[in-house]
Interface confidence: low
C-alpha cells in the first residue's frame, strides 16, 4: 500500500464545529487483495517540526481515510498551541496519517508510507459562504501532484470536494471534471467525485499526465469556472530488463598504437527502458563481471560502468530511460612487443529486475593486441641559419605513427660524427613521441668548417630494447651577424613590433624575434606579442624544449603572475590576453595592456587617464588606473 | 505521426544491382536504430540487415553479406539498402522498420513496403 | 543462430474463441520475444514485446507469457478483424529471427 500525496491541505478555523468533515486520504494498492488501514499519529506538529501538543482534535475513519474534526478547535486550545510555537506565529499545522501496518512508533513521515496533512490556520471563524470566491470553493491552496505506482491495481487517488465548504455551504452547488486527452488512464466519477485508474499504468509508454481539473461553481444564478493543473507522475519498478540497442553484443576492438593505461579499447551500449535502481544505488544493483580468463586478461583489462539518464520517445511523449555505457579499459601500460588475440566475456546483471525472464546480458569483447614496430625514414635533411639562438627548434623526427602513439616510451638520441660541430640537440616531446631538434651550441654553429652536420637518429623503446635508425644531414646557412647591443634574452620582454624585430632572444631559429599582431578582438587567444618564432610560441602549450629555458616562450610557459586583462593557462602561461602581453622573466610577470596604437574609442577621458596614471600615480595604483582602462576599452 | 517511405524496388536482373531508400519522417530520425525486413511471396518474415542510430553498427544476416549494405543519411532522414550479385532468392517485399526505442529491438513502426523481383 | 518454430502453422477458429499460439527458441532468450500481427496486402505490427507486454494501443484481448524457450501469445475471445497471420520474434542476439508464422483464418 502506498500514498497517492505525499502531502495534503486543508484550512482550519476556530469554532469550526465538531463533526466538520475536513478531508480524504487515499492509498492505493500494490497488490489487488490489499486493504487499506489508516491511522493518525498522536501529535500536531508547528514550525520547524515542533512537537506542539498531544492531537485531541482531529480524527480519522481507518477505513475510508477521512479526516474530520472530533471536536471543535476553540480560542483558548489555538492560544495554548501557539505558546508552544518557538515564539512563532502559528500560521501552519500537520499531522502525520500512517498506512497500517507500520511501526507504532511516530518516527520520520516518508512517502510511500505516511503522509503529512497541513492545516493552514485562521484565528477567525468560518467565514461567511457568500464571500468565497470561487476559487476558494473549489480547490485547496496548495495545488496537489499525485504519484502513481506503475504496474499496480487501479484504484481511487483523489476526492474533489471540498468537504468543509460541502458541509458548512450545502446551498452552494460544485461540479468537477477532467480535462483530458482520449484513451487516458484516469476517471472522475460525477457522483462521488472520485478520481480513480481505469487500469495499471506503463510508465515506460508515459511517465507525466499534464491533467487540467474544471470546477463550476453554481450560487444562486451565477456559475463560474475555475481550471487547475492536475498533474500525476508515474513511479518507475525494475521491470524492464537491459537490453542491446541494434542488437549489437559484440564490440571488436584493435590495440595498437594507443597502449597506455586507461585507455579505452571497446564500449558497448546497453539500453534499460527504467530509471531505477536510483542513481545512488545503481552501481551497487547493477553489477558487471569481467569473466574469468587467463590471469594476463585479468590483469590488463577492467570493465567500467558509465550509466546516464537519456529520454526516449513513446506514444508522443518523452520519457526517461538509461543507457549503460560498458568500457573495455587497458589497466595498465601495454609493451610494444605484446601480440595476442583474445575474446573477453562481461556479465551484466539487473538485480533487481523481477521478470519475466531474466535481467542478465552478456557482453562479448574481441581484442586483438598487435605489436609495434619502430621504424624511422632512411634519411632526414634539415637547414639552420648560422644566426639561429640556442634552443631553437629547427626540425622534428618522428617514428612511424608516433603521432598516434600513447603509453608508448620512446626515446630520441642524436650521434654526430664530427666531435666539434655537434651543435644540435634532440628531446622526446610527451605530446606525440616525437623528437623535437633544437640547437643546442651556437658556438659550433658558427664555425666555418660546421656548414655540414651529420647525425644518426637513434629512436629506442627502452622496455623492449627495440630501436630505429636514420642519417640526420643539417646544412648550415648564411652568415652569423652580431646582434644589436641592449637586446634582452628574451624575445617576450618587447611590447612594441620595431624594438621586437630589431632583436634575437633564445629559440630564434633566425637570429630574429617575431612580432605576432592580434586581432584586437577583447580578451582574445590572438593576443599581440613577440615570440621567436610564431610556429610555436605562443600556442598555449609549454613544450618540451620551452621547459628548457623560461627565457624562451614566458608567453606559454610563465607560472607567475599575469596583470591584466587575461585567462590563465592550463596549468601555466597565457591562455587569452587583452591587446599586447609581454613578460619579464627573471620577474616572473607578464602584463597585457591596450595596443598603444590609437583606438577612435579612446577619448579624451581616457588619453587623460592613462596620462595620469602613467606619470603621476605609483605602480600599484598605476595597475589599478590600467584595469580601469582596460574597462573603458572593453566597454 | 510516423511514417517511413519505401521506393527503389522494381525488376532487377540476375547479377545486377539495385539501391532501396527509405524516407522517414514525424520522429527524429537520428535517434534510432533502423533495420530491413524481407518477406518473399507467400512466405514468412526475414529479417535482412541493421543499421545503429550513428550509422556506426552495420549488421547483415549471413545470406546477404558482401551482397548488401545498409547505409544511412541523417540529415537526409533516409536508410538504403544497397543491393548487388542479386539472384532469384532475393525476391521479396523489403520492409524497412524503426527500432523501438523503449524495447530494445522491436520493430514499432514498418513502412508499406516495395517489391524487388529478381528475373532475367 | 538461434532458431524460432512456431506451431500451428494455421488454424481455423470462430469469432469469440480462445486462441493459443506457440513459438519456441532453439536456446534461451530469456524475455526477449516480440509477437506481430500481419493482414494480406500490409506490413507487420507489433502486438507484444518482452513476451508479455502489449504495445500501446493494441486491445488488451492479447495476451503474451513465457520466459526462457517456450512462449504463447493468446487471444481471449477472437474478433473479426483478429484472422490474419501471426510471427514470433527473438531480439536476443544476432541476427534477428522469425519464427515460420501462423495463419489463423475463420472457421
Known amino acids: 500500500l502506498y500514498f497517492s500525496r505525499d502531502a495534503y491541505w486543508e484550512k482550519l478555523y476556530v469554532d469550526q464545529p465538531a463533526g466538520t468533515p475536513l478531508l480524504y486520504v487515499h492509498a492505493l494498492r500494490d497488490a489487488p487483495e490489499e486493504v487499506p488501514s489508516f491511522r493518525l499519529g498522536q501529535h500536531l506538529y508547528g514550525t520547524y517540526r515542533t512537537r506542539l501538543h498531544e492531537n485531541n482534535w482531529i480524527c480519522i475513519q481507518e477505513d475510508t481515510g477521512l479526516l474530520y474534526l472530533n471536536r471543535s478547535l476553540d480560542r483558548s486550545s489555538w492560544e495554548k498551541l501557539s505558546g508552544r510555537n518557538r515564539g512563532f506565529p502559528l500560521l501552519t499545522v500537520y499531522l502525520k496519517v500512517f498506512l497500517s501496518p507500520t511501526s507504532l512508533r511516530e518516527g520520520e513521515c516518508q512517502w510511500p508510507g505516511c503522509a503529512r496533512v497541513y492545516f493552514s490556520f485562521f484565528n477567525t471563524s468560518f467565514p461567511a459562504c457568500t464571500s468565497l470566491k470561487p476559487r476558494e470553493l473549489c480547490f485547496p491552496e496548495t495545488r496537489p501532484s499525485f504519484r502513481i505506482r506503475e504496474n499496480r491495481p487501479p484504484g481511487t487517488f483523489h476526492q474533489f470536494r471540498l468537504l468543509p465548504v460541502q458541509f458548512l455551504c450545502p446551498n452552494i452547488s460544485v461540479a468537477y471534471r477532467l480535462l483530458e486527452g482520449e484513451g487516458l488512464p484516469f476517471r472522475c466519477a460525477p457522483d462521488s467525485l472520485e478520481v480513480s485508474t481505469r487500469w495499471a499504468l506503463d510508465r515506460e509508454q508515459r511517465e507525466k499526465y499534464e491533467l487540467v481539473a474544471v470546477c463550476t461553481v453554481h450560487a444562486g444564478a451565477r456559475e463560474e469556472v475555475v481550471m487547475v493543473p492536475f498533474p500525476v507522475t508515474v513511479y518507475d519498478e525494475d521491470d524492464s530488463a537491459p537490453t542491446f540497442p541494434a542488437g549489437v553484443d559484440t564490440a571488436s576492438a584493435v590495440v595498437e598504437f594507443k597502449r597506455k593505461e586507461d585507455t579505452v579499447v571497446a564500449t558497448l551500449r546497453v539500453f534499460d527502458a527504467d530509471v531505477v535502481p536510483a542513481s545512488g544505488e545503481l552501481v551497487r544493483r547493477y553489477t558487471s563481471t569481467l569473466l574469468p580468463g587467463d590471469t594476463w586478461t585479468q590483469q590488463t583489462f577492467r570493465v567500467e560502468h558509465w550509466p546516464n539518464e537519456t529520454s526516449v520517445q513513446a506514444n508522443g511523449s518523452f520519457v526517461r530511460a538509461t543507457v549503460h555505457d560498458y568500457r573495455l579499459v587497458l589497466n595498465r601500460n601495454l609493451s610494444i612487443s605484446e601480440n595476442r588475440t583474445m575474446q573477453l566475456a562481461v556479465l551484466v546483471n539487473d538485480s533487481d529486475f523481477q521478470g519475466p525472464g531474466a535481467g542478465v546480458l552478456l557482453l562479448h569483447f574481441n581484442v586483438s593486441v598487435l605489436p609495434v614496430s619502430l621504424h624511422l625514414p632512411s634519411s632526414y635533411s634539415l637547414s639552420v641559419s648560422r644566426r639561429a639562438r640556442r634552443f631553437a627548434q629547427i626540425g622534428k623526427v618522428c617514428v612511424e605513427n608516433c603521432q598516434a602513439f600513447s603509453g608508448i616510451n620512446v626515446q630520441y638520441e642524436l650521434h654526430s660524427s664530427g666531435a666539434n660541430c655537434s651543435t644540435l640537440g634532440v628531446v622526446t616531446s610527451a605530446e606525440d613521441t616525437s623528437g623535437i631538434l633544437f640547437v643546442n651550441d651556437t658556438k659550433a654553429l658558427r664555425r666555418p668548417k660546421c656548414a655540414e652536420l651529420h647525425y644518426m637518429v637513434v629512436a629506442t623503446n627502452h622496455q623492449t630494447s627495440r630501436q630505429a635508425q636514420a642519417q640526420l644531414l643539417v646544412t648550415v646557412e648564411g652568415l652569423y651577424v652580431a646582434e644589436e647591443a641592449g637586446c634582452p634574452l628574451s624575445c617576450a620582454v618587447s611590447k612594441r613590433r620595431p624594438e621586437c624585430e630589431e632583436c634575437g632572444g633564445l629559440g630564434s631559429p633566425t637570429g630574429r624575434c617575431e612580432w605576432r599582431q592580434g586581432d584586437g578582438k577583447g580578451i582574445t587567444r590572438n593576443f599581440s606579442t613577440c615570440s621567436p618564432s610564431t610556429k610555436t610560441c605562443p600556442d598555449g602549450h609549454c613544450d618540451v624544449v620551452e621547459t628548457q629555458d623560461i627565457n624562451i616562450c614566458p608567453q606559454d610557459c610563465l607560472r607567475g603572475s599575469i596583470v591584466g586583462g587575461h585567462e590563465p593557462g592550463e596549468p601555466r602561461g597565457i591562455k587569452a590576453g587583452y591587446g599586447t602581453c609581454n613578460c619579464f622573466p627573471e620577474e616572473e610577470k607578464c602584463f597585457c595592456e591596450p595596443e598603444d596604437i590609437q583606438d577612435p574609442l579612446c577619448d579624451e577621458l581616457c588619453r587623460e587617464q592613462k596620462l595620469i596614471s602613467e606619470e603621476d600615480l605609483g605602480g600599484e595604483q598605476k595597475l589599478i588606473s590600467e584595469e580601469d582602462l582596460h574597462h573603458h576599452h572593453h566597454h | 505521426q510516423v511514417q517511413l517511405v519505401e521506393s527503389g524496388g522494381g525488376v532487377g536482373q540476375p547479377g545486377r544491382s539495385l539501391r532501396l531508400s527509405c524516407v522517414a519522417s514525424g520522429f527524429t530520425f537520428r535517434n534510432y536504430g533502423m533495420h530491413w525486413v524481407r518477406q518473399a511471396p507467400g512466405k514468412g518474415l526475414d529479417w535482412v540487415a541493421i543499421i545503429g542510430y550513428d550509422g556506426s553498427k552495420e549488421y547483415n544476416v549471413d545470406s546477404v553479406k558482401g551482397r548488401f549494405t545498409i547505409s544511412r543519411d541523417n540529415s537526409k532522414n533516409t536508410l538504403y539498402l544497397q543491393m548487388n550479385s542479386l539472384g532469384a532468392e532475393d525476391t521479396a517485399i523489403y520492409y524497412c522498420?524503426?527500432?523501438?526505442?523503449?524495447?530494445?529491438?522491436?520493430?514499432?513502426?514498418w513502412g508499406q513496403g516495395t517489391l524487388v523481383t529478381v528475373s532475367s | 543462430d538461434i532458431q524460432m518454430t512456431q506451431s500451428p502453422p494455421s488454424l481455423s477458429a470462430s469469432v469469440g474463441d480462445r486462441v493459443t499460439i506457440t513459438c519456441r527458441a532453439s536456446?534461451?532468450?530469456?524475455?526477449?520475444l516480440n509477437w506481430y500481427q500481419q493482414k494480406p496486402g500490409k506490413a507487420p505490427k507489433i502486438l507484444i514485446y518482452a513476451a508479455s507486454r502489449l504495445q500501446s494501443g493494441v486491445p488488451s484481448r492479447f495476451s503474451g507469457s513465457g520466459s526462457g524457450t517456450d512462449f504463447t501469445l493468446t487471444i481471449s475471445s477472437l474478433q473479426p478483424e483478429d484472422f490474419a497471420t501471426y510471427y514470433c520474434?527473438?531480439?536476443?542476439?544476432?541476427?534477428?529471427?522469425f519464427g515460420g508464422g501462423t495463419k489463423v483464418e475463420i472457421k
Open positions: 520474434q527473438q531480439s536476443y542476439s544476432t541476427p534477428l529471427t
Open positions: 522498420a524503426r527500432e523501438s526505442p523503449i524495447t530494445g529491438t522491436t520493430f514499432d513502426y
Open positions: 536456446q534461451s532468450i530469456g524475455n526477449y
